[in-house]
């Protein structure tokens, strides 16, 4: 696909960055847990 060709020396990109500063808050890792017998289990 010519639209996504890459020259020699460049690899296909896979990572997604937080490029816009305004997205910093919406991309902070959230810990969602389940309380089981007094212990929080991450899920």
């Amino acid at each position: 696909d010519a639209e996504f060709r890459h020259d020699s020396g460049y690899e296909v990109h896979h990572q997604k960055l937080v490029f816009f500063a305004e997205d910093v808050g919406s991309n902070k890792g959230a810990i969602i847990g389940l309380m089981v017998g007094g212990v929080v289990i991450a899920c």
């Epitope: 997604k16 960055l17 490029f19 816009f20 500063a21 997205d23 910093v24 991309n27």
Partner: antibody, heavy 112, light 112 residues
Framework: EVQLVESGGGLVQPGGSLRLSCAAS????????MSWVRQAPGKGLELVAQ????????YYPDTVKGRFTISRDNAKNTLYLQMNSLRAEDTAVYYC?????WGQGTLVTVSS | DVVMTQSPLSLPVTLGQPASISCRSS???????????LHWFLQKPGQSPRLLIY???NRFSGVPDRFSGSGSGTDFTLKISRVEAEDVGVYYC?????????FGQGTKVEIK
């Protein structure tokens, strides 16, 4: 792999309308701001619209304000640009961009 | 809007020699998280812009280590340690600290 694929460009008469679409894949679309950037022949990059991750905030430069509308459907992983009252000076390649990734571009030609 | 000013606008280079492009912003690009969202793109003829350096000095995946970025606050630099034939094109600096996303005018790099 992250991909952004635009569609909807073409030839339109002055005063006409077009709706561009950008199908996103390979990342969690709903977490990221998105933009439309255009490039007139032989010119530099010009932002024409920007929208935040949830679609609640948008930005337009004066050159397109009131004529262009950016929107997104996070359920469909798709970004849109509705372009009305098109002018000859809107002729350009329009790119959908997440900043780090750009689509292949779609050509919009406004001519009678 | 934040104005991005690049220099030079045209840069003839010799293969194997270093090259440097300067970018200045009209206001500080430091965000509240301590990062400067200053980026560098390369656009080759007929292609979409491609991210080279993000947040001042970080090479994007797959970008050769001959590319490096530096700077802080309002003054930034892109350096190519040894120019190769595939490095020709137009280089843009860009900021995404502030809305709207803005670009420099572009620096055209060509082989002497």
């Amino acid at each position: 792999e992250v991909q952004l694929v635009e569609s909807g460009g073409g030839l339109v008469q002055p005063g006409g309308s077009l709706r561009l679409s950008c199908a996103a894949s390979g990342f969690t679309f709903s977490r990221y701001s998105m933009s439309w950037v255009r490039q007139a022949p032989g010119k530099g990059l010009e932002l024409v619209a920007q929208i935040n991750s949830v679609g609640s905030s948008t930005y337009y430069p004066d050159t397109v304000k009131g004529r262009f509308t950016i929107s997104r459907d996070n359920a469909k992983n798709t970004l849109y640009l509705q372009m009305n009252s098109l002018r000859a000076e809107d002729t350009a390649v329009y790119y959908c961009a997440s900043g780090d990734y750009w689509g292949q571009g779609t050509l919009v030609t406004v001519s009678s | 809007d934040v104005v991005m000013t690049q220099s030079p606008l045209s840069l003839p280079v010799t293969l194997g020699q270093p090259a440097s492009i300067s970018c200045r912003s009209s206001q500080s690009l430091i965000y509240s998280d301590g990062n400067a969202y200053l980026h560098w793109f390369l656009q080759k003829p007929g292609q979409s812009p491609r991210l080279l350096i993000y947040k001042v000095s970080n090479r994007f995946s797959g970008v050769p280590d001959r590319f490096s970025g530096s700077g802080s606050g309002t003054d930034f630099t892109l350096k190519i340690s040894r120019v190769e034939a595939e490095d020709v094109g137009v280089y843009y600096c860009s900021q995404s600290t502030h809305v709207p996303w803005t670009f420099g005018q572009g620096t055209k790099v060509e082989i002497k």
